[in-house]
Amino acid sequence: LQSQGVSLYIPQATINATVKEDILLSVEYSCHGVPTIEWTYSSNWGTQKIVEWKPGTQANISQSHKDRVCTFDNGSIQLFSVGVRDSGYYVITVTERLGSSQFGTIVLHVSEILYEDLH
């Protein structure tokens, strides 16, 4: 995903997970200067901003995801101990200082561990 100011690459657009797993939502970006990175969650239950930060500074994590999210300077985030309700669309927006933006989507499917799966 390329523009004059921002390029964004998402290696894995769909992630399948089971409950209690820690999940890395992996991205790579490049741009001029230090961008603002924002992750938003969208599902049938609604939409909310998860976190916003400039790499190298402290992240502003929403109350709903406090202690559940870890940010990385490459734009990726990790979700800890996911539940079924964490399934949905995770949208990253990278905005450079001059205002150029790119967005990309990762779809997360979280399922229960079925008893049969263990045997």
């Epitope: 523009s3 769909t14 939409t47 669309y89 949208v91 927006t93 790119q102 967005f103 990309g104 989507t105």
Partner: antibody, heavy 126, light 108 residues
């Protein structure tokens, strides 16, 4: 019914600027993201820009980043596209289109183009 | 950017026949973010399907969509005279949003 009417097209010299407008009616304009799409004569469709419902998020095609600016005035139910430094490659019919909620159920990110205007032709020629 | 390649470029069929149009993506697209449009000469495009398989309002059920990952298909089960047009696929899950080059369905 949903209606989108573009205006502002015409013949413009290379290097000059133009502002296109799209007047919206028949729906709650302020609740929807909006797109601009263009189509060069005899060619396919090219997405140009998107603006979210409150104008907080804007995305552009690579080919127009830095030259085109999308904006909106929700009090006037109008979408705008400012196009600068025009070249002959910009000759096209410009359509405005409403962004359906699609999969998001949410208007801060682009959805499918569920209603289109009739288009406004911009011809760049000296 | 995600490049969408449509095939064939032109499809010559008779009314009543089945039309199968292909759209291939350069990288995976989650099905929720793929749409199909129809455009007739001199007219604006019209949304047919979104989320790969959901018909837009007022679209007849002879239009259906399927596929996942990188391969998507639009099927018109029985062509009506008004279905002869150009069809575009489009993805809206990543910026920049992109269209395929189009498939023209013409009367044989």
């Amino acid at each position: 019914q949903v209606q989108l009417v573009e205006s502002g097209g015409g013949v413009v010299q290379p290097g000059r600027s133009r502002r296109l407008s799209c007047a919206a009616s028949g729906f709650a304009f302020r609740n929807y993201g909006m797109h601009w799409v263009r189509q060069a004569p005899g060619k396919g469709l090219e997405w140009v820009a998107f603006i979210s419902q409150n104008g907080g998020k804007k995305y552009y095609a690579d080919s127009v980043t830095g030259r085109f600016t999308v904006s909106r005035d929700n009090s006037k139910n109008t979408l705008y596209l400012q196009i600068n430094s025009l070249t002959t490659d910009d000759t096209a019919v410009f359509y405005c289109a409403r962004s359906g909620s699609g999969s998001w159920g949410y208007s801060d990110f682009p959805g499918p183009f569920d209603h289109w205007g009739q288009g406004s032709l911009v011809t760049v020629s000296s | 950017e995600i490049v969408l390649t449509q095939s064939p470029g032109t499809l010559s069929l008779s009314p009543g026949e089945r039309a199968t149009l292909s759209c291939r993506a350069s990288q995976n697209i989650f099905i929720s973010f793929l749409a199909w449009y129809q455009q007739k000469p001199g007219q604006a495009p019209r949304l047919l399907l979104y989320g790969a398989s959901n018909r837009a309002t007022g679209i007849p059920d002879r239009f259906s969509g399927s596929g996942s990952g990188t391969d998507f298909t639009l099927t018109i089960s029985r062509l009506e005279p008004e279905d002869f047009a150009v069809y575009y696929c489009q993805q809206y899950g990543s910026s920049p949003l992109t269209f395929g080059g189009g498939t023209k369905v013409e009367i044989k």
